[in-house]
Interface confidence: medium
């Protein structure tokens, strides 16, 4: 009669995390009798992961085929897999001893791949708001995926940007990995309503990838221009200069009007117009009483936009 | 002989807050000798429901005598059920062994889904009161609602409204879910007696949906009209002058009479006209001794409403 | 009602033995494992072993293989705890309990020469 | 053999005080098979929490259970006269079975 053989038919399983994997595994013979062992790796360190005669092993399950009283098959099924169970797994029989059962023969092995989706990509952008023409980074994160390779692309608004670093870590094997991109964003005036995407694509996505944005207006400072201008009246001794404060992100925007220097009044902006851009307009106007001053007067509009340096603009007005 | 098979006959069972669920096993065969356990989920952090010869199960009950000698039915009902409870629950064979018993077959499992009610609607408006043809935002919350399908409507005076956007969170597989709404409604001048109401249909109602309202009253505030009138007096030296105050909401209202800019006095609305649509009307008065001024009199009737900036409507009283 | 009812006190010599019984009411041995714990004077609880009267098949704690043996008798519905060889160590108070939930009065044995 | 560790082995609590007992296995226990024993003197054990967390029929609320792998734990929210006794913790999850060996709570 021949020896038993110990049959492993999968050289290798690749299992999606949080399925069951099916490792499969027969003996030839009923002889010698003995128990079957399943091992996670070879050697002294190797991992019990399912003993046919003792211990407890709750996601291990015999696979539940309609067999006959002389089962030859010891294939199991191991429930919830997650990255960390990849590795190569033994079938072994063990023959009958005393005191302990000894080692008879073990399958040549099976091993075990686990394909672990990315996590979500999020993309975060600078702490503080930059102005246009100057350069930001966004960076993307996502993590616990499995196998290694990965593609990661940067868009602007659809367009796909060169400007970026990537790193996938760690550099050696390891049950999942973390990928962490850096990308160099040229800021423009129109912006605000500019968006910058991170695009992941990986083998368990099944072609469909996935996307973290993240809105430039979130991290842009579009300066204000300003106008001063001096509008008709119909009465003599007034005069209506107007201060229209154009094109500016984000609202955030205090006013002050000045004679000769000295303020006369100081407004916040509330109702703006939004233009198509994103960007934002305002108007204010000064009536000043033309009989109050002898001389020419100077006024200027100086304005503090979300919280940096005020900026200004002056008009003389002559005093006919 | 054939190996026994562990049949579990229903892929899922749905089963309403607080009611009792059966879960159905039955075994094809009484060999191998061994205990019959039930557990929630799969793998190592599998949950154990119900341990046939031993242990304490108090919410479950067996719904045979597990102690007839050939039986077969291991069905198991598990009292008053929550959300908490919902899963997928295996019948598992063991089979005697040393020195722990061995797991022998698993049923394929039976779905338990949970059907919970959403939690009566909460309406919530804007912490500020805002005026007419502005838009303010209101809230609608619900808990507890199982399974995650859920459809919400928003309605104003029973005309149902467009403009909101719906969440249901989480996004992912979850006990239980929360529902978050918020609708945009534009005011118009008669929203005081409105109402917005939060309707939501769920598979546990029944067709009958929970509505939730809120009143537009709490978040309206309509500025009042003001009208500056003479009127008749017999007597010679004295003026009645009224301020008709029309058409406001909330009640909040304070109103000085200034003479030549000077405050002559002060009064806070108590007795209001309700008009059909809400609002309130009032009128205040003031009795002007002619013979106290050489010079016409401008008169000048100043309301405060809710807090907010004084508007005024002023008159000239000739003194002839 | 579940109920589990353990033979009266017993006073032994050393080196004799002594079978304890527990019989069940209100439910059927045969359903459940019966299990031993030994408890000496203000001391705590020991696992001696537990059997499966469906089949008699037993299992024991290290400590009392050879000391212990633990038998059932599904017709009478009782489960015995039979102590060989006693000694004063052997003084304590033996619980029978079913499945780890509903537990007896408990029997005192006295080894005492 | 888990060797079940439990500690204080005595402590006294006043009425009103937050009591935690503490039960460490030398190696992981499964959380189904974590079973708390109340016992007073003259007395059965008698089944207090079961499966790590859950409170046996008649069991006061403010009774809680908690904890995985080696270490979990028996907490009193509000201590009660009526909970002077000693406490065993109790593994099923392998053979041979163990207790700990016990806390003896007294009211201060």
């Known amino acids: 009669e021949d020896e038993l053989q110990v049959i492993q038919p999968e050289k290798s399983v690749s299992v999606a995390a949080g399925e069951s994997a099916t490792l499969r595994c027969a003996m030839t013979s009923l002889i010698p009798v003995g128990p079957i062992m399943w091992f996670r790796g070879a050697g002294a360190g190797r991992e019990l992961i399912y003993n046919q005669k003792e211990g407890h092993f709750p996601r291990v399950t015999t696979v539940s085929e309609l067999t006959k009283r002389n089962n030859l098959d010891f294939s199991i099924s191991i429930s919830n897999i997650t990255p960390a169970d990849a590795g190569t797994y033994y079938c072994v029989k063990f023959r009958k001893g005393s005191p302990d059962d000894v080692e008879f023969k073990s399958g040549a092995g099976t091993e075990l791949s686990v394909r672990a989706k990315p996590s979500a990509p999020v993309v975060s952008g600078p702490a503080v708001r930059a102005t246009p023409e100057h350069t930001v980074s966004f960076t993307c994160e996502s993590h616990g995926f499995s196998p290694r390779d990965i593609t990661l692309k940067w868009f602007k608004n659809g367009n796909e940007l060169s400007d970026f670093q990537t790193n996938v870590d760690p550099a050696g094997d390891s049950v999942s990995y973390s990928i962490h991109s850096t990308a160099r964003v040229v800021l423009t005036r129109g912006d605000v309503h500019s968006q910058v995407i991170c695009e992941i694509a990986h083998i368990t996505l099944q072609g469909d990838p996935l996307r973290g944005t993240a809105n430039l207006s979130e991290a842009i400072r579009v300066p204000p221009t300003l106008e001063v201008t001096q509008q008709p009246m119909r009465a003599e001794n007034q005069a209506n200069v107007t201060c229209q404060v154009s094109n500016f992100y984000p609202r955030g925007l205090q006013l002050t009007w000045l004679e000769n220097g000295n303020v006369s009044r100081t407004e916040t902006a509330s109702t703006l117009i939004e233009n198509k851009d994103g960007t934002y307009n305002w108007m204010s106007w000064l009536l000043v009483n033309t009989c109050a001053h002898r001389d020419d007067v100077v006024l200027t509009c100086q304005v503090e936009h979300d919280g940096q340096q005020a900026v200004s603009k002056s008009y003389a007005l002559e005093i006919s | 002989e054939d190996e026994l098979q562990v049949i579990q006959p229903e892929k899922s069972v749905s089963v309403a807050a607080g009611e009792s669920a059966t879960l159905r096993c039955a075994m094809t065969s009484l060999i191998p000798v061994g205990p019959i356990m039930w557990f929630r989920g799969a793998g190592a952090g599998r949950e154990l429901i119900y341990n046939q010869k031993e242990g304490h199960f108090p919410r479950v009950t067996t719904v045979s005598e597990l102690t007839k000698r050939n039986n077969l039915d291991f069905s198991i009902s598990i009292s008053n059920i929550t959300p908490a409870d919902a899963g997928t629950y295996y019948c598992v064979k063991f089979r005697k062994g040393s020195p722990d018993d061995v797991e022998f077959k698993s049923g394929a499992g039976t779905e338990l889904s949970v059907r919970a009610k959403p939690s009566a609607p909460v309406v919530s408006g804007p912490a500020v009161r805002a005026t007419p043809e502005h838009t303010v935002s209101f809230t609608c919350e619900s808990h507890g609602f199982s399974p995650r399908d859920i459809t919400l409507k928003w309605f104003k005076n029973g005309n149902e409204l467009s403009d909101f956007q719906t969440n249901v969170d989480p996004a992912g597989d979850s006990v239980s879910y929360s529902i978050h709404s918020t609708a945009r409604v534009v005011l118009t001048r008669g929203d005081v007696h409105s109402q917005v109401i939060c309707e939501i249909a769920h598979i546990t109602l029944q067709g009958d949906p929970l509505r939730g309202t809120a009143n537009l009253s709490e978040a309206i505030r309509v500025p009042p009209t003001l009208e500056v009138t003479q009127q008749p007096m017999r007597a010679e030296n004295q003026a009645n002058v009224t301020c008709q105050v029309s058409n406001f909401y909330p009640r909040g209202l304070q109103l000085t009479w200034l003479e030549n800019g000077n405050v002559s006095r002060t009064e806070t609305a108590s007795t209001l006209i309700e008009n059909k649509d809400g609002t309130y009307n009032w009128m205040s008065w003031l009795l002007v001794n002619t013979c106290a001024h050489r010079d016409d009199v401008v008169l000048t009737c100043q309301v405060e409403h809710d807090g907010q900036q004084a508007v005024s409507k002023s008159y000239a009283l000739e003194i002839s | 009602e579940v109920q589990l009812q353990q033979s009266g006190a017993e006073l032994v010599k050393p080196g004799a033995s002594v079978k304890l019984s527990c019989t069940a009411s209100?439910?059927?041995?045969?359903?459940?494992?019966m299990h031993w714990v030994k408890q000496r004077t203000e001391q705590g609880l020991e696992w001696i072993g537990r059997?499966?009267?469906?089949?008699?098949?037993?299992k024991y704690a290290p400590k009392f293989q050879g000391k212990a043996t633990i038998t059932a008798d599904t017709s009478s519905n009782t489960a015995y705890l039979q102590l060989s060889s006693l000694t004063s160590e052997d003084t304590a108070v033996y619980y029978c309990?079913?499945?780890?939930?509903?537990w007896g009065q408990g029997t005192l044995v006295t080894v005492s020469a | 053999q888990i060797v079940l560790t439990q500690s204080p082995a005595i402590m006294s609590a006043s009425p009103g005080e937050k009591v935690t007992l503490t039960c460490s296995a030398s190696?992981?226990?499964?959380?189904?098979?974590l079973y708390w024993y109340q016992q007073k003197p003259g007395s059965s054990p008698k089944l207090w929490i079961y499966?790590?967390?859950n409170l046996a029929s008649g069991v006061p609320a403010r009774f809680s259970g908690s904890g995985s792998g080696t270490s979990y734990s028996l907490t009193i929210s509000s201590m009660e006269a009526e909970d002077a006794a000693s406490y065993f913790c109790?593994?099923?999850?392998?053979?041979?079975?163990?207790f700990g060996g016990g806390t003896k709570l007294e009211i201060k």
């Open positions: 059997i499966d009267p469906e089949d008699g098949e037993t």
């Open positions: 209100g439910f059927n041995i045969k359903d459940y494992y």
């Open positions: 109790h593994q099923w999850s392998s053979y041979p079975y163990t």
């Open positions: 190696s992981s226990v499964s959380s189904s098979y």
């Open positions: 309990d079913r499945g780890l939930a509903y």
């Open positions: 499966s790590t967390s």
